[in-house]
Interface confidence: low
């Protein structure tokens, strides 16, 4: 059965700075990532593979990442209020077959203790 | 509404084995990972063992290397654990996880699933 809150953890934060998890089924080859902040595109990042199966990795608006074969994780350093706000993961996919993913989104809260450099 | 459902577990005597069963059912557009996890009395959830979609082994707690085998039918979108040799101190209440993507209309939303657990109790 499913699990009350069953969505996995979207943002972890460390070190001042805050990483979002952005999953996708991975059964897929070759697609678009982008993290969106309210509605606009903070970082993207395209996946897709060529002959001999290179992989090639390319990012539009560019964000620290970090890729795995399930996940694109994007992040933020250097955290203050200006940051919190609504994220969602936006996928595209261009194989297998192409289709639009929404991955389901959150609200990133940011209180004193996950800022970069409080004043003590 | 997707569903995890279990069997296979029960009372069994020291070196003997069982199989679990985890089949997943209902809107399912695609699994990531499935894993066994279990819990025994005053314990935390642990990880017995874990697959990717594509079927390699990503782990195996050391406590079951050699005995437990994690297996899986991606056609029936159901995993496996095969439990030889068991030990008393596996007795445990065992659940399986999977890493599940469901469709609403054009979306599709990665979600973790639970089933509900099944006990398994190792004694002469």
């Known amino acids: 059965e499913i699990n009350g809150s069953a969505n996995y953890e979207m943002f972890i934060f460390h070190n001042g700075g805050v990483q979002i998890l952005c999953k996708y089924p991975d059964i897929v080859q070759q697609f678009k990532m982008q993290l969106l902040k309210g509605g606009q595109i903070l970082c993207d990042l395209t996946k897709t593979k060529g002959s001999g199966n290179t992989v090639s990795i390319k990012s539009l608006k560019f964000c620290h990442s970090q890729l795995s074969n399930n996940s694109v994780s994007f992040f933020l350093y250097n955290l203050d209020h200006s940051h919190a706000n609504y994220y969602f993961c936006n996928l595209s996919i261009f194989d297998p077959p192409p289709f639009k993913v929404t991955l389901t989104g959150g609200y990133l809260h940011i209180y004193e203790s996950q800022l970069c450099c409080q004043l003590k | 509404q997707v569903q995890l459902q279990q069997s296979g577990g029960g009372l069994v005597q020291p070196g003997g084995s069982l199989r679990l069963s985890c089949a997943a059912s209902g809107s399912i557009f695609s699994i990531n990972g499935m894993g066994w996890y279990r819990q025994a009395p005053g314990k935390e959830r642990e990880l017995v063992a874990g697959?990717?979609?594509?079927?390699?082994?990503?782990n195996y707690a050391d406590s079951v290397k050699g005995r437990f085998t994690i297996s899986r039918d991606n056609a029936k979108n159901t995993v496996y654990l095969q439990m030889n040799s068991l030990k008393p101190e596996d007795t445990a209440v065992y659940y399986c996880?999977?890493?599940?993507?469901?469709?609403?209309?054009?979306?599709?939303?990665?979600?973790?699933?639970w089933g509900k657990g099944t006990q398994v109790t190792v004694k002469p």
């Open positions: 697959l990717t979609s594509g079927g390699s082994v990503t």
């Open positions: 996880r999977a890493e599940i993507f469901t469709r609403t209309g054009e979306n599709y939303y990665g979600m973790d699933y």
